[in-house]
């Protein structure tokens, strides 16, 4: 069975048209959202930004893989984006949406 | 198709003896570490503590499941524990270790 690559950030451009949001989002047309994927396997090196709990969980998983899963690869740093959109009353609003862009990933 | 259990906290007691750490950790003998597991599937409800990015990623996954994974179930709140241990010079040290206990989980 194939070995998965280690937990890391992957590039992903999200088009608001693809999501069906083009009628209420004016700008941008899309954004670089990115995503996290990959294995959190022993040993968890420094690049994996692992928490102490993730290190403990990895060791427990090795002892007891049927009951305790590996930690998962998740965002450790997220950025906001500004979105220009129509609200329910057709007013044009500029709003900053938090935690929209993955900047870094780690084992959690 | 089988019903998936949603992302949530699961109880897990970790024994330092099982980890082979009994020779350097004096106290405690173990601790309630817990772990996160479960599905982050559409729709992500309020209990799932999902980030904006996780909501977007879930929608992209539905459109393109082969290339973009579902968000993963990871700790959203972690607590510290105090550990009494021997250092390399056999001194007894009391240290607070951050991010050791899972208090809450969410979709990331």
């Amino acid at each position: 069975s194939e070995l998965k690559t280690a937990c890391k950030k992957h590039e992903l451009y999200v088009s608001f048209q693809d999501l069906g949001w083009q009628d209420w989002i004016i700008a941008p047309k899309g954004y670089a959202a990115n995503y996290c994927d990959g294995e959190c396997s022993f040993p968890l090196n420094a690049h994996m930004n692992a928490t102490n709990h993730a290190i403990v969980q990895t060791l427990v998983h090795l002892m007891n893989p049927e009951y305790v899963p590996k930690p998962c690869c998740a965002p450790t740093k997220l950025n906001a984006i500004s979105v220009l959109y129509f609200d329910d009353n057709s007013n044009v609003i500029l709003k900053k949406y938090r935690n929209m862009v993955v900047r870094a990933c780690g084992c959690h | 198709s089988e019903l998936k259990t949603a992302c949530k906290k699961h109880e897990l007691y970790v024994s330092f003896q099982d980890l082979g750490w009994q020779d350097w950790i004096i106290a405690p003998k173990g601790y309630a570490a817990n772990y996160c597991d479960g599905e982050c599937s559409f729709p992500l409800n309020a209990h799932m503590n999902a980030t904006n990015h996780a909501i977007v990623q879930t929608l992209v996954h539905l459109m393109n499941p082969e290339y973009v994974p579902k968000p993963c179930c990871a700790p959203t709140k972690l607590n510290a524990i105090s550990v009494l241990y021997f250092d390399d010079n056999s001194n007894v040290i009391l240290k607070k270790y951050r991010n050791m206990v899972v208090r809450a989980c969410g979709c990331h």
């Epitope: 069975s1 070995l3 002892m63 007891n64 049927e66 | 089988e2 019903l3 259990t5 699961h10 597991d37």
Partner: antibody
Framework: QVQLVESGGGLVKPGGSLRLSCAAS????????VHWVRQAPGKGLEWVGR??????????MYAAPVKGRFTISRDDSKNTLYLQMNSLKTEDTAVYYC????????????WGQGTLVTVSS | QSVLTQPPSVSGAPGQRVTISCTGS?????????VHWYQQLPGTAPKLLIY???ERPSGVPDRFSGSKSGTSASLAITGLQAEDEADYYC???????????FGGGTKLTVLG
């Protein structure tokens, strides 16, 4: 005491189907991960697949030779594990065991007595 | 062919010590996963003999011991007895998808 009892084995033609059952007693079945392991006549043990607990979404995993043909399920209310075998091949001939996974180190601490499946024309 | 490699057979006289090796790779034993050992007496189901590398379930004599180093594990049997004649299997996991892997089995013959 802990007991696992398999049933449903027998003679089946290639391409046919069979459903094996494994009745559990003497323990809280729903709290355990359970597996199917097989042993062809005169050969070694071969892992077939497993099903996790409700808390892990009853996730299943299968060995490559049976993937897409075999399906593992469980009914915790009946304390029973199942193995649905479709598109059977002669090389599936084996004694099929169900096995419970102990909860601290994941070893197979209890096994059924096995049920023989013979695939032959 | 099994993912974990065991010698097909070993033998020893009563009272002797024998060891059975189990060689894996960096994706299973070498990845840090636990190793378990099973004993299968003729015509019976396998029985857990050693779990978590070196722990014995209750009822297993201390003549049986297990160890692990790097990508290999081994089972040692001291004070060999006629009733130890059986097939022995090692088992671990493959790290890529946490699939169960077995060794091919070792037939232990007690001489005499």
């Amino acid at each position: 005491q802990v007991q696992l009892v398999e049933s449903g084995g027998g003679l089946v033609k290639p391409g046919g189907s069979l459903r094996l059952s494994c009745a559990a007693s003497g323990f809280t079945f729903s709290s355990y991960v359970v597996h199917w392991v097989r042993q062809a006549p005169g050969k070694g043990l071969e892992w077939v697949g497993r099903i996790k607990r409700e808390s892990s979404s009853y996730t299943t995993m299968y060995a490559a030779p049976v993937k897409g043909r075999f399906t593992i399920s469980r009914d915790d209310s009946k304390n029973t594990l199942y193995l649905q075998m479709n598109s059977l091949k002669t090389e599936d001939t084996a004694v099929y065991y169900c096995a419970r996974v102990e909860r601290s180190k994941s070893g197979f601490d209890n096994w059924g007595q096995g049920t023989l499946v013979t695939v032959s024309s | 062919q099994s993912v974990l490699t065991q010698p097909p057979s070993v033998s020893g006289a009563p009272g002797q010590r024998v060891t059975i090796s189990c060689t894996g790779s960096s994706s299973n034993i070498g990845a840090g996963y636990s190793v378990h050992w099973y004993q299968q007496l003729p015509g019976t189901a396998p029985k857990l003999l050693i779990y978590g590398q070196s722990e014995r379930p209750s009822g297993v004599p201390d003549r049986f011991s297990g160890s692990k180093s790097g990508t290999s594990a081994s089972l040692a049997i001291t004070g060999l007895q006629a009733e130890d004649e059986a097939d022995y299997y090692c088992q671990s996991w493959d790290s890529s998808q946490t699939l169960v892997v077995f060794g091919g089995g070792t037939k232990l013959t007690v001489l005499g």
